[in-house]
């Protein structure tokens, strides 16, 4: 909501999760792994990489089925705590200028830092308009105090807020699982909010920094070449 059409393939780590239709976003973090939101879990997912217009075959797409879909063991569907999911692709993505991985964070998100949010979600705060072309939004990371004041009692240490307290610009339905990137690092995963782009109701995002060890351990445990002793 309130964003702009991204320059074609300018978000090369952005993926679309498809089950006959786009339902969530995700981020490519290595040639064979994608991170998304825990609440985007489905038993069968096709990962679509290199997408810009999801309704048109433009020649840069790679469609790869999910081989493994691993939701965080402490995911809570009621509170959306630990809202993170890993997908292992059935074959490695071909990395090029239009499809490439995003780095995991080396530090937690800092208030005031500009970030890029992207997705194919609803662009209206009231009503619905699902775009064909990838949308981008530049938005600041909010302080934890602002985040907690916006959603008293709902924000865990695994969540942070990004956006504008005045409303008007936000992620929305269909953006879930997609990336929040600051300084070339994946800081957030689109998770939840009260409505979209409402005043004093910024978007809430999964704090990827808290899951770096889990991500690395899960990838290691699900790689074919790890040794058994």
């Amino acid at each position: 909501v309130g964003g702009y059409i991204c320059e074609e393939n300018s978000v090369p780590y952005q993926v679309s999760l498809n089950s006959g239709y786009h339902f969530c976003g995700g981020s490519l973090i290595s040639e064979q792994w994608v991170v998304s939101a825990g609440h985007c879990y489905k038993s069968r997912i096709q990962v679509r990489l290199g997408e810009h217009n999801i309704e048109v075959l433009e020649g840069n797409e790679q469609f790869i089925n999910a081989a493994k879909i691993i939701r965080h063991p402490k995911y809570n569907s009621r509170t959306l705590d630990n809202d993170i999911l890993l997908i292992k692709l059935s074959s490695p993505a071909v990395i090029n200028s239009r499809v490439s991985a995003i780095s995991l964070p080396t530090a937690p998100p800092a208030a005031g830092t500009e970030s890029l949010i992207s997705g194919w979600g609803n662009t209206l705060s009231s009503g619905a308009d699902y775009p064909d072309e990838l949308q981008c939004l530049d938005a600041p990371v909010l302080s934890q105090a602002e985040c907690e004041a916006s959603y008293p009692g709902k924000i865990t240490n695994n969540m942070f807020c990004v956006g504008f307290l005045e409303g008007g610009k936000d992620s929305c339905q269909g953006d879930a699982g997609g990336p929040v990137v600051s300084n070339g690092e994946l800081q957030g995963i689109v998770s939840w909010g009260y409505g979209c782009a409402q005043k004093n109701r910024p978007g809430v995002y999964t704090k990827v920094y808290n899951y770096v060890d889990w991500i690395k351990d899960t990838i290691a445990a699900n790689s074919h070449h790890h040794h058994h002793h």
């Epitope: 269909g174 953006d175 939840w192 009260y194």
Partner: antibody, heavy 128, light 108 residues
Framework: QVQLVQSGAEVKKPGASVKVSCKAS????????MHWVRQAPGQGLEWMGA????????NYAQKFQGRVTMTRDTSISTAYMELSRLRSDDTAVYYC?????????????????????WGQGTTVTVSS | EIVMTQSPATLSVSPGERATLSCRAS??????LAWYQQKPGQAPRLLIY???TRATGIPARFSGSGSGTEFTLTISSLQSEDFAVYYC??????????FGGGTKVEIK
């Protein structure tokens, strides 16, 4: 149980206004869009507009813009639809309908909407 | 606005037979499509949402399929209570929300 109860039938003269109420019970009123749909005799369903009871934001079909006003009173969990400058072709059954997608604490997965609860309908007859 | 077109306008079927109703969107609506049943003098009743998910309490003989622009509602074995008018509706892009013109399923 979850239900929507509408006000009774109305007979109006051309040029007059009508205000139909829709009282919700059995769920959190502010948590779901309320839509209004009408059906002229022997015709199909026609969407008129919707209100977000949480924010008060409205969306109207262009056809009714300037003639329809949708409001709500959250203290009594009631939505209202007022149609002004009535004409004979406004004779129809007017329905309120709840969108089952939750507006509050919304996860941002793609939500597939639908009208899961409908009012019983209010017949509005416009005749001179 | 997205135009929804239903066909046929009327479908004559014998009880126990299969009924296949079609709904076409003028542009892609993804899976944001619902089907309703309406009987004379009654409010519509939700049958299917998300193109293929049966609403609570709807019998298994009703099934929905399709995505994008082409959708189908199938009633596998028509019962006497299934003779009614059926409407499709898109939620992908609104305002305005749009309904198809309806398909009347009548006894042959």
């Amino acid at each position: 149980q979850v239900q929507l109860v509408q006000s009774g039938a109305e007979v109006k003269k051309p040029g007059a206004s009508v205000k139909v109420s829709c009282k919700a019970s059995g769920y959190t009123f502010e948590g779901h869009y309320m839509h209004w749909v009408r059906q002229a005799p022997g015709q199909g369903l026609e969407w008129m507009g919707a209100i977000n009871p949480y924010s008060g934001q409205t969306n109207y079909a262009q056809k009714f813009q300037g003639r329809v006003t949708m409001t709500r009173d959250t203290s009594i969990s009631t939505a209202y639809m007022e149609l002004s400058r009535l004409r004979s072709d406004d004779t129809a059954v007017y329905y309120c309908a709840r969108d089952f997608v939750l507006l509050l604490r919304q996860s941002r997965i793609l939500h597939e909407s639908a009208f899961d609860i409908w009012g019983q309908g209010t017949t509005v007859t416009v005749s001179s | 606005e997205i135009v929804m077109t239903q066909s046929p306008a009327t479908l004559s079927v014998s009880p126990g037979e299969r009924a296949t109703l079609s709904c076409r969107a003028s542009q892609s609506v993804g899976s944001n499509l619902a089907w309703y049943q309406q009987k004379p003098g009654q409010a519509p009743r939700l049958l299917i949402y998300g193109a293929s998910t049966r609403a609570t309490g709807i019998p298994a003989r009703f099934s929905g399929s399709g995505s994008g622009t082409e959708f189908t509602l199938t009633i596998s074995s028509l019962q006497s209570e299934d003779f009614a008018v059926y409407y499709c509706q898109q939620f992908h892009n609104w305002p305005p929300l749009t309904f198809g013109g309806g398909t009347k399923v009548e006894i042959k």
